[in-house]
């Protein structure tokens, strides 16, 4: 019967008595940087070309016995997970292996860099179809390794890496912390994060998504027909490399940004038990388990968005945090979050010719996060309209006044330390389609975009008193682009998007009593693109 | 293609004319930075990736590497250039004493230097 991991990533329409999705990634080449591999194992023979690249450190210990099957174990298994005949994800993908890990599974940053350079040079000498690079390894945070990954990604290569097996924040490791790399955590058959001895999968904002990574059946280097079960974030990353190969084989023109958005979009949502993660990491960790798209084509009409969290600002009075979108993505909205509730909001600002989302800490605050909503919006022309604090009036408002521009997000930023001491009026204007409304002492920023066929609408959900969180979701066919809180009292910890739901978190004051002034409203801006929908219908 | 031996002779002469043999300060007055792995057991001191500024050409990378070797030799240090990077990042991989880091950080074109460290199968 089909192994649990292949079943988990397969949409129901492909599930028969065996895993046989269409197009096994035959147009794609997957580079594997790992240990040596048994390339003529029955499961992968003819699918893996062993390059002559080898850059590994000496094995530790004077009495180390080099046993071929042990040297090949990790890489052979991963090659099998990516493209194995019987237990592989992308059965049609061809692979090339580079040896950067020794028989103990240890390598160096420098060896990995030289390996990545080798791939880039190969790509220049003999350009082929789409390339996926699988990096099933991790070391401490490395500026140079992250930089090399960024360069390779900007050359059109898709890099997929293991989040790491340290039960820790993936941002502390490389290449997991490189924003351009697709970083994969591991889950098990019960959709629980994988525990590995006393440790387990890494987590946090640097993880893009999770994938099966426990008890994964794959080729064993013990013999040419052997299989073995292995666990780890390497196995999880291998699943995503396989899925990426299949998506790219079906749509070879996909950019890295488009591929990442699709991986996120087609993932199973909210199935991971977050209690396993440290409490402060739960909100930052994506609750996504990778899956193949239900069909290889036809996703083009969708407006894809994802949420990008910044690093923590730190607690100093003037500390700020910045969240950035990928080069091919548009920043459609910006929000902020602070566990202490002490923050001074957020704003969208230009940095190096691109909009970024900056959140501001407040005096006495433990720090803030900036949360960017990053979307794929072809031919978009977006700008930020700002209204300074209205002071005396009912509240500050700003709208999109340019012809054909629609509101995709609202942000507010204030200089006063605590808006809660400056109570807003009880009666406040309702949100209007092209208008942002905020506290009278805050400056309000509207993200206004013009793109072919783009239409947006505002959805609100308010509750009379803060009860931890308020949510509002966009309906089927619409994509959440903006998420903010109205009016932004001291009880509000912040707002952020989780998939297609806008979440506004506030301090639970149900025990201390509350007034109607402390009502909290979650405001979602939901958009869709008629242009993309029409374009995809014309293709079919 | 420039005459590399010529470059090297020119380099040595230039170094001899410097009072204490220190390299010229980096351009634009920016200071190159040094990075190393936060996890001590994973550090590999003695091997360093010298990353040069983005637009540095291969010939400049080679020249900078040779310059470092020449200056180190004058101080009685042996260095070995293990690899010259080009294609992704400009720079070079060097085996040298950590005592030379201050010197290396002052070389022209240097953006930052990172001590090598271990990576592990996951």
């Amino acid at each position: 019967s089909i192994p649990w991991n292949l079943e988990r990533i397969t949409p129901p329409r492909y599930r028969a008595d065996e895993y046989q999705p269409p197009d096994g990634g035959s147009l794609v080449e997957v580079y594997l940087l790992d240990t040596s591999i048994q390339s003529d194992h029955r499961e992968i023979e003819g699918r893996v070309m062993v390059t002559d690249f080898e850059n590994v450190p000496e094995e530790d210990g004077t009495r180390f016995h080099r046993q071929a099957s042990k040297c090949d174990s990790h890489g052979t298994h991963l090659a099998g997970v990516v493209s194995g005949r019987d237990a592989g994800v992308a059965k049609g993908a061809s692979m090339r292996s580079l040896r950067v890990l020794n028989c103990q599974g240890k390598g160096t940053v420098s060896g990995t860099l030289i390996g990545l350079e080798f791939i880039r040079k190969s790509q220049l000498v003999q350009p082929v179809g789409p390339l996926v690079v699988l990096l099933p390894l991790a070391g401490g945070y490395s500026r140079v390794l992250n930089a090399a990954c960024q360069r390779l990604a900007r050359a059109g290569v898709v890099l997929v890496t293991a989040a790491g097996n340290f039960r820790d924040d993936a941002c502390l490791y490389s290449p997991a912390s490189a924003p351009e790399v697709i970083t994969v955590g591991a889950t098990n058959a019960q959709d629980q994060p994988v525990t590995l001895g006393t440790l387990g999968t890494n987590f946090g904002r640097c993880v893009d998504l999770f994938a099966p990574g426990e008890d994964i059946i794959g080729a064993s280097s013990d013999c040419s027909t052997c299989f073995v079960s292995q666990s780890g974030t390497s196995q999880a990353a291998a699943h995503v490399a396989g899925i990426a190969a299949m998506m790219l084989s079906a749509e070879p023109e996909l950019t890295l940004a488009e591929l990442r958005q699709r991986l996120i979009h087609f993932s199973a949502k909210d199935v991971i038990n977050e209690a396993w993660f440290p409490e402060d990491q739960r909100v930052l960790t994506p609750n996504l388990v990778a899956a193949l798209p239900p069909s290889t084509h036809g996703a083009g009409w969708q407006l894809f968005c994802r949420t990008v969290w910044s690093a923590h600002s730190g607690p100093t009075r003037m500390a700020t945090a910045i969240a950035r979108c990928a080069p091919d993505e548009e920043l459609l909205s910006c929000s902020s979050f602070s566990r202490s509730g002490k923050r001074r909001g957020e704003r969208m600002e230009a940095q190096g010719g691109k909009l970024v989302c900056r959140a501001h800490n407040a005096f006495g605050g433990e720090g803030v996060y900036a949360i960017a909503r990053c979307c794929l919006l072809p031919q978009a022309n977006c700008s930020v309209h700002t209204a300074p604090p209205a002071e005396a009036s009912m509240g500050t408002r700003v709208h999109c006044h340019q012809q054909g521009h629609v509101l995709t997000g609202c942000s507010s930023h204030w200089e006063v330390e605590d808006l809660g001491t400056h109570k807003p009026p009880v009666l406040r204007p309702r949100g209007q389609p092209n208008q942002c409304v905020g506290h009278r002492e805050a400056s309000i920023h509207a993200s206004c975009c013009h793109a072919p066929g783009l239409e947006c609408k505002v959805k609100e959900h308010g509750i009379p008193a803060p009860q931890g969180q308020v949510t509002v979701a966009c309906e089927e066919g619409w994509t959440l682009t903006g998420c903010s809180a109205l009016p932004g009292t001291s009880h509000v910890l912040g707002a952020y998007a989780v998939d297609n739901t806008c979440v506004v978190r506030s301090r639970d004051v149900s025990t201390t009593g509350s007034t109607s002034e402390e009502a909290v409203t979650a405001v979602a801006i939901c958009c869709r693109s008629r242009h993309l929908a029409q374009a995809s219908q014309e293709l079919q | 293609q420039e005459d590399e031996d010529g470059d090297y002779e020119e380099l040595v002469l230039a170094l001899r004319s410097e009072e204490d043999g220190l390299a010229e300060a980096p351009e634009h007055g920016t200071t190159a930075t040094f990075h190393r792995c936060a996890k001590d057991p994973w550090r590999l001191p003695g091997t360093y990736v010298v990353v040069l500024k983005e637009e540095t050409h291969l010939s400049q990378s080679e020249r900078t590497a040779r310059r470092l070797q020449a200056q180190a030799a004058r101080r009685g240090y042996l260095t070995k250039i293990l690899h010259v990077f080009h294609g992704l990042l400009p720079g070079f991989l060097v085996k040298m004493s950590g005592d030379l880091l201050e010197l290396a950080l002052k070389l022209p074109h240097v953006d930052y230097i990172e001590e090598d460290s271990s990576v592990f199968a996951q």
Epitope: Q20, D86, K91 | -
Partner: antibody, heavy 115, light 109 residues
Framework: QVQLVQSGAEVKKPGASVKVSCKAS????????ISWVRQAPGQGLEWMGW????????NYAQKVQGRVTMTTDTSTSTVYMELRSLRSDDTAVYYC????????WGQGTTVTVSS | QSALTQPASVSGSPGQSITISCTGT?????????VSWYQQHPGKPPKLMIY???NRPSGISNRFSGSKSGNTASLTISGLQAEDEADYFC?????????FGGGTKLTVL
Amino acid sequence: QVQLVQSGAEVKKPGASVKVSCKASGYALTSYGISWVRQAPGQGLEWMGWISAYNGNTNYAQKVQGRVTMTTDTSTSTVYMELRSLRSDDTAVYYCARGYGMDVWGQGTTVTVSS
Amino acid sequence: QSALTQPASVSGSPGQSITISCTGTNSDVGGYNSVSWYQQHPGKPPKLMIYEVSNRPSGISNRFSGSKSGNTASLTISGLQAEDEADYFCSSYTSTSMVFGGGTKLTVL
């Protein structure tokens, strides 16, 4: 192009041994092992075993285990199959084929065992 | 006695379609995606026609197709031609080895 070239026909007496060679060319040798298959006159195909060109590991069919030895000479890209204690029912055409997938075949070597 | 069962012979007229079956168990055909079909003309080595159940190597006519259901694999040849007359063998992985069918003689009438 991908080619497997086998040695010539052999006539052997019962109890003797035969060693058939198979020279591979035109592909990355370590990406595939070599399978050996035999076909008795007018009969079907019988898989005898496999040898790794990568590390020399072998996987023999139970029926010939103990009588067969497969070896490789990587310097000449040649694989050998030796069958010992020959019997008359070992008379067959012996083929080498690329890998377990057997996508490319040698031309065959006729081995006749007769007293 | 071959591990996989094939009909001893099948026949068809030019232009017709024929199907050859290959029945095994869930330890071979049913358990793996690696069923292959070979064509063998007299005095020649076998030639791979279908691999991994349904894939055609380059250069093989699209008149040849393969499929599998449960423990039975099938080879279908459409638009029969005189040169298709040959012996056809199926093969499959087992957990540690390879097995062949006994072969099917295809006669083009």
